[in-house]
């Protein structure tokens, strides 16, 4: 028998520094977690103690904090190189700055192989990107070799900016021939490493002949055997065992997100490459694990540029940006409109001639808007200003919901109207009319939504049975502010870009902004 230790991360999303327990900015260092300096300590400890160790990343290192905004992926290559990752799969967020924003900072600088079998380059890009990412890699480990095949969510064109010269194929269809090649090479221990979410991870384990282990990402899935060490609730045991169509037991793992845990899986193979046993658990990277001093020093050196950036002007406003709770929790506020417009703008993807865009709607809990921005400071807007408006380090995500769920959400928005509660929704691509004289749960008297399958966008009545795409804060997607119906009834959820980054990019693009209150939210006569 031969034993392999797989250490894995996924969806780190730019958390290079340690964070608080909820993966936001670290406030009390004695209670902070994660970060590359702490990760390195644990990885090195395991490498010293165990003979055959692989350190793998399942994608979405990009996007999530000011680190990515400023360094644009150079920080990912630098610190992953320092940690000596063995391989990485491409995630959807690796394409957030376009293909060039992937090639230059990461693909050309990473000292480890970057993988995806289901992304095929065409046209002029094919020669430019050739060899910079690979479908598979054969990694020598001790006296054996391990094959690693990569995969990436085929939804990436809807979630990011890969351009028109990359084709995202079906994961299973693309993986099988690459696994077959590895078998031909007499590589009999094969890991599928990728970024398509837990459901697809399980399908790959079931359907792709020859895959021994699946290491996934994208869905931020937390698996654990035994009593979990922090706040995350396990979606299943670690590893999650799938019985493949050819009768093998295939372990599937994921390690939550944000570098809070280091996935730790021990696999025992027989001489023919069959998995005899698999066990492990994610390791919580809490303050009991010291930060490596040399990596920490390097982090501090790279930090300097971030502090300078946050006070630089992104653009100007010539109007007061009303982000006060007195406005945003009671009525349409222009800060809410600005943020929603930025959210839609960030999701412009012309992927189909029939649609002007794949998504037109935004909802945003008023309680998530934490500050106004005064235009009387020469109109200057900085990252620091935006961090006061959106201090929680959330993301603006893409969900699919039925019209009936949206209707419930808007009823919830005003079910206890007047108490300055955070669930009052700001909107984009939606016209809503409330009648507060009616009883809670029946106050939405008009709900029109902007069409997507149209060449000239116009507002049409919401259809209860239709499925709509909506951009919203991850806080709402997870049922926050009492929006349980969104969490329970959503048909699909893909995590998006960092909230501040979305708004800052929009302001930089527009240069001068002047959002108005324009009748997106109305109250019928006599009720307000």
């Amino acid at each position: 028998a031969w034993e392999l230790t797989i250490l894995h991360t996924n969806d780190v999303h730019s958390r290079l520094e340690q964070t608080s327990e909820d993966s936001s900015k670290c406030v009390n260092a004695s209670r902070c977690m994660g970060g590359v300096a702490r990760l390195f300590t644990k990885v090195q400890q395991i490498r010293r103690a165990e003979p055959n160790v692989l350190l793998l990343d399942a994608g979405d290192q990009y996007q999530g904090t000011i680190w990515f905004t400023v360094y644009k992926g150079a920080e990912v290559a630098h610190f992953m190189n320092a940690l000596r990752y063995d391989a990485m799969a491409l995630g959807n967020h690796e394409f957030d700055n376009g293909v060039e924003g992937l090639i230059e900072p990461l693909l050309k600088e990473a000292k480890f192989p970057i993988l995806s079998a289901n992304i095929k380059a065409k046209g002029p890009l094919a020669s430019q990107i050739s060899g910079l990412y690979l479908p598979y890699k054969v990694l020598p480990v001790g006296d054996e070799v391990v094959g690693i095949v990569g995969y990436t969510s085929k939804e990436t064109p809807f979630l990011s900016n890969p351009g028109t010269n990359l084709v995202f194929e079906d994961e299973i269809t693309a993986l099988q021939p690459e696994v077959d090649k590895l078998k031909t090479l007499n590589v009999n221990k094969i890991i599928a490493l990728g970024h398509s979410g837990f459901e697809m991870d399980k399908l790959i384990a079931q359907k792709v002949r020859g895959v021994d282990v699946v290491v996934g990402g994208h869905s931020n899935t937390f698996l654990y055997t035994g009593n979990p060490p922090s706040k995350e609730v396990p979606a299943g045991k670690y590893p999650f065992i799938v019985t493949s169509d050819d009768g093998r037991k295939v372990p599937v793992v994921q390690a939550y997100a944000f570098g809070k845990y280091l996935g730790y899986l021990k696999i025992e193979f027989d001489e023919r490459g069959n998995v005899i046993s698999s066990h492990g658990n994610p390791i919580l990277l809490n303050s009991s694990i010291p930060e490596d001093p040399s990596i920490k020093a390097d982090i501090n050196k790279w930090r300097i540029k971030l502090d300078n950036y946050s006070t630089q002007e992104l653009g100007k406003t010539i109007v007061y940006l009303d982000g006060s709770s007195q406005s945003c929790r009671f009525r349409e506020c222009n800060m809410g409109n600005l943020i929603c417009d930025a959210m839609i703008n960030n999701n412009l993807r012309h992927t189909d001639e029939m649609f002007w865009n794949h998504v037109s709607m935004c909802i945003l809990n008023g309680g998530g808007i934490r500050s106004p921005i005064d235009e009387r400071n020469n109109g200057t807007i900085t990252w620091e200003n935006l961090a006061a408006v959106l201090p929680f380090g959330g993301t603006f995500d893409l969900v699919q919901l039925k019209g009936s769920t949206l209707k419930k959400a808007f009823e919830h928005s005003v079910h206890r109207y007047g108490q300055s509660t955070g669930e009052f929704l700001q909107v984009g691509g939606i016209h809503v009319v409330y009648d507060l004289s009616r009883k809670p749960g029946d106050r939405v008297v008009k709900l029109d939504v902007l069409c997507t399958k149209c060449r000239v966008p116009s507002y049409d009545p919401l259809k209860m049975d239709e499925v709509y795409k909506v951009i919203l804060p991850n806080f709402l997607a997870n049922g926050g502010d009492g929006f349980q119906m969104i969490k329970d009834e959503l048909l699909r959820h893909d995590s998006g870009d960092q909230d501040i980054n979305v708004v800052s990019t929009y302001i930089s693009k527009m240069k001068v902004i002047y959002p108005a209150v324009e009748g997106r939210i109305k109250f019928s006569t006599g009720s307000h």
């Epitope: 990473a110 000292k111 050739s130 060899g131 054969v138 090479l185």
Partner: antibody
Framework: QVQLVQSGAEVKKPGASVKVSCKTS????????IYWVRQAPGQGLEWIGW????????KYNEKFKGRATLTADTSASTAYMELSSLRSEDTAVYYC????????????WGQGTLVTVSS | DIQLTQSPSFLSASVGDRVTITCKAS??????VAWYQQKPGQSPKLLIY???TRHTGVPDRFSGSGSGTEFTLTISSLQPEDFATYYC?????????FGQGTKVEIK
């Protein structure tokens, strides 16, 4: 573009050792295997072994085990092949090469280094 | 070790001819076969890998086929620059081995 440039020709006495270098450029050295192949005068090709600079693991043709040593210097993006206990039948052109996809054919080759073993 | 036997060892042909070189493996290697072209005083050049995949920049007159133990390299219309020695190689089992070569000469 990918380039592999080898050190110059060597003349060695039987029993001696030779170390051939292969300096790479145009790609990330640690991400690809370096393979070594030799070709005796007027003869065919013979695989010696490979090294993976990402973690310095090596694999040798049993015929060369114990005599060939493959190493790599990642800071210089250079691979080395040392052959010891040289005999006259080791006279050959020694090539380093790189693939496109692991193992699947040697796509890029050095210009070759002629090693002559003669007393 | 897996032996690869190429045939013919020598081949005389004219420009424009269709040329076929075969490579027989002593045991099955699936499709883990590459073909190379080598001219005197030069390094070998990869033509085909995975038995039938043409390497970037290789003219489409070169094609490969076969799986298991029998493989073929075909040059559909021989050009003056194609006169060289051709080698097959298997990378399915260690030690990786090459055929003895087929020298294509001008008739």
């Amino acid at each position: 573009q990918v380039q592999l440039v080898q050190s110059g020709a060597e003349v060695k006495k039987p029993g001696a050792s030779v170390k051939v270098s292969c300096k790479t450029s145009g790609y990330t050295f640690t991400r690809y295997y370096i393979y070594w192949v030799r070709q005796a005068p007027g003869q065919g090709l013979e695989w010696i072994g490979w090294i993976y600079p990402g973690n310095f693991n090596t694999k040798y043709n049993e015929k060369f085990k114990g005599r060939a040593t493959l190493t790599a210097d990642t800071s210089a993006s250079t691979a080395y092949m040392e052959l010891s206990s040289l005999r006259s039948e080791d006279t050959a052109v020694y090539y380093c090469a790189r693939d496109v996809y692991d193992y699947a054919g040697f796509a890029y080759w050095g210009q070759g280094t002629l090693v002559t073993v003669s007393s | 070790d897996i032996q690869l036997t190429q045939s013919p060892s020598f081949l005389s042909a004219s420009v424009g001819d269709r040329v076929t070189i075969t490579c027989k493996a002593s045991q099955g290697v699936a499709t883990a076969v590459a073909w190379y072209q080598q001219k005197p005083g030069q390094s070998p050049k990869l033509l085909i890998y995975w038995a039938s995949t043409r390497h970037t920049g290789v003219p489409d007159r070169f094609s490969g086929s076969g799986s298991g133990t029998e493989f073929t390299l075909t040059i559909s219309s021989l050009q003056p620059e194609d006169f060289a020695t051709y080698y097959c190689q298997q990378y399915s089992s260690y030690p990786w081995t090459f055929g003895q070569g087929t020298k294509v000469e001008i008739k």
